[in-house]
Amino acid sequence: ATKLTEEKYELKEGQTLDVKCDYTLEKFASSQKAWQIIRDGEMPKTLACTERPSKNSHPVQVGRIILEDYHDHGLLRVRMVNLQVEDSGLYQCVIYQPPKEPHMLFDRIRLVVTKGFSGTPGSNENSTQNVYKIPPTTTKALCPLYTSPRTVTQAPPKSTADVSTPDSEINLTNVTDIIRVPVFN
C-alpha cells in the first residue's frame, strides 16, 4: 500500500488555504474531481467537486471553497477563503472514476486554523488578519453519490453539523450535495 503523507498548513481565521493536487494529465484531465474532508472515525465527506466532465480552468465555487481544474497543467487548484477555526481538519483531493472507487491524490492536507494570532514560530504576532469577503456561491457542481461494499461495515458519520461554519457568509450545512465515499486504506 502507498504510504499516505500529509502537509500541514497553519493559518489564521480570515486567511486563504491555496493548494494544488497534481494528477496524471493523460489519464485524468477531464475526470470529475473532488475536495474532501476526513474526520476521525468517519468516511471522507465531499465538500465540493468539479463539473462532469471537468472543464478546463472553469472555477467552481461551493461556499468558501473554489476549485479550478487546469487540464493543461495536470493540477487541481483548491482554495478555501476566509478560513474559520471550524475548517481545521484533514483534507484530500480525489478523482471520480466510476464504476471504480475514487482515486486519491497525494498529498493530504492537514489544516489548522487558529483564532487571532497563531503564536507559531515564523508567524508575525503583530500582523493583521485579512477581512476579505467573497461573493455568494456562483457555480455549484453536483457531486455523484457512490456506494461501496466497504462502507457497509463502517459507522455512519455522527453528524453533518461538524462542517458548519457559523461565522462565514455561507454555511456548509446548507450544501445538500455533500456525499460520502469509501475510506482509502
Epitope: 502537509e7 486563504t16 497534481d22
Partner: antibody, heavy 121, light 105 residues
Amino acid sequence: QVQLVQSGAEVKKPGASVKVSCKASGYTFNGYYIHWVRQAPGQGLEWMGWLNPNSGGANYAQKFQGRVTMTRDTSISTAYMELSRLRSDDTAVYYCARDQRKTTVTPFEYWGQGTLVTVSS
Amino acid sequence: SYELTQPPSVSVSPGQTASITCSGDKLGERNVAWYQQKPGQSPVLVIYQDNKRPSGIPERFSGSKSGNTATLTISGTQAMDEADYYCQAWDRNVVFGGGTKLTVL
C-alpha cells in the same frame, strides 16, 4: 541542505538558442515544481514558467509560449530551460527556483545563483 | 493578464518603520509572498502566506493583508535592509509585482 546550482554565463547571437541547466540536490527532485524567473538589467523579476519534474509537464507564461521549452533529466536531478530565437532584449539573469512545498505553486523558497545570458551581435 | 501594483520606491530613516504595499484584483483570495533582492544576489523569501516568516528572517519583517492590498512592514529599519522588494501571487500563472526600491536614508 537544498541547493540549486545553475550552469555558467552564456553569450549568444540574435536568433540563436540558449539552454540553461539547474541541478538540484538535498531533496527528492520529483516532488517539487521548478520555476524559471528572469531579470533584465535594472528591471524586475519576470516569471517564465514552471516544470513538474514528476510528469515532465510544463506551464509557460503567455509571453514565452512557442519560444521556451522546460525539460528535466530525473536521473541526474537536473532541470533545463531552453529559449530560442533570442533577441537583444532577452539579455538577462535567468534563475531557477523551487516551490516551498509539494502542495503549493508559490512561494519560491530556494533559488539558484542565476545565469547571465547576453544576446549580442 | 493579472497584475500586482507596487510603489516604485520607498524611503525611510534608520530605525523608522517602512511600509511597502502590493495591490491586485481579488488579492484577498490569494496568498502573497514577499522577496528581498540585493544587487548582484538572488532573491530571498522574507514573507509567505501573507504574514509568515521563513526561519532566519528577522522579526522586524512582517506582512499583513486587508482586502485586496498586502503590506510588507519593516520595523526598526536597518541599513542592511536597503534592497528591492517584490510581492508575488498565484493567479492562473505566477505573478510578481513590479518591485519597490527601499532606500534607507
